[in-house]
Interface confidence: low
Amino acid sequence: LVPHLGDREKRDSVCPQGKYIHPQNNSICCTKCHKGTYLYNDCPGPGQDTDCRECESGSFTASENHLRHCLSCSKCRKEMGQVEISSCTVDRDTVCGCRKNQYRHYWSENLFQCFNCSLCLNGTVHLSCQEKQNTVCTCHAGFFLRENECVSCSNCKKSLECTKLCLPQIENVKGTEDSGTT
């Protein structure tokens, strides 16, 4: 089975690489615009130049194209703790990232928030903090790992998973949190 192609893909596939089919005349293949530019006017005929114009400030195209408009530059989300790694240019979108000793937590494919890397207090670093992953901690004796934090076994209750790790201390524990299920 041949996968279904959209109209644009069908039209482009008729022309050699780096060219696209003229929207009003399917016998003409026009040269695509370079990255950093956009399509202002289609080529008037075979072998004639496509009219491409440079993207204006605040917009870009990152690959060869026949877009009628450049794409708007992304803005780094300050409320997510993001910082600008490199500014937008005509041929590259803004690159956003996190500060030193922070990692990216992705809420969705395109939305991330910066959080401080865990310091593994009351434990040791098992895996260092990565660009997209928090530090992985291993806890010292008398502590157990909960939500990437080493918590004292005095906070362990019989109803929680920590009982295996905190077995010797579990008999005389007085919990400080409500562990009722909903």
Epitope: M80, W107, S118, L160, D178, S179
Partner: nanobody, 119 residues
């Protein structure tokens, strides 16, 4: 896009009750600890309560312990805050919050819901 929509606020007399709801979308609700924070008029944000992703651990600020109950329904992507024995000092805008760990900074969206306790 991550969205949190708080509702259920209103005017209530001291000693009364309210139930706040937070409808969540745009992220995998069941993966995250959720909570409530509030901002009284002219004051900073105050942490109120938090619940683990599975619902088996709940944490409360001392100021609300014994009066407020946090719960969640993972099948409905909804967080709740049952507020009983309300006091004038509970007057605030209440915001729904997402956490990636117990003491991680939270993030919140939406306008919040205003709770006014007054006679």
């Amino acid at each position: 896009e991550v969205q949190l929509l708080e509702s259920g606020g209103g005017l209530v007399q001291p000693g009364g009750s309210l139930r706040l709801s937070c409808a969540a979308s745009g992220f995998t609700f069941v993966k995250y600890s959720m909570g409530w924070v509030r901002q009284a008029p002219g004051k900073g944000l105050e942490w109120v309560s938090q619940i683990a992703n599975t619902g088996d651990r709940r944490y409360y600020a001392d100021s609300v312990k014994g009066r407020f109950t946090i719960s969640r329904d993972n099948s409905k992507n909804t967080l709740y805050l049952q507020m009983n024995s309300l006091r004038a000092e509970d007057t605030a805008v209440y915001y729904c919050a997402i956490y990636t760990g117990r003491w991680e900074p939270f993030v919140y969206w939406g306008q919040g819901t205003l709770v006014t306790v007054s006679s």
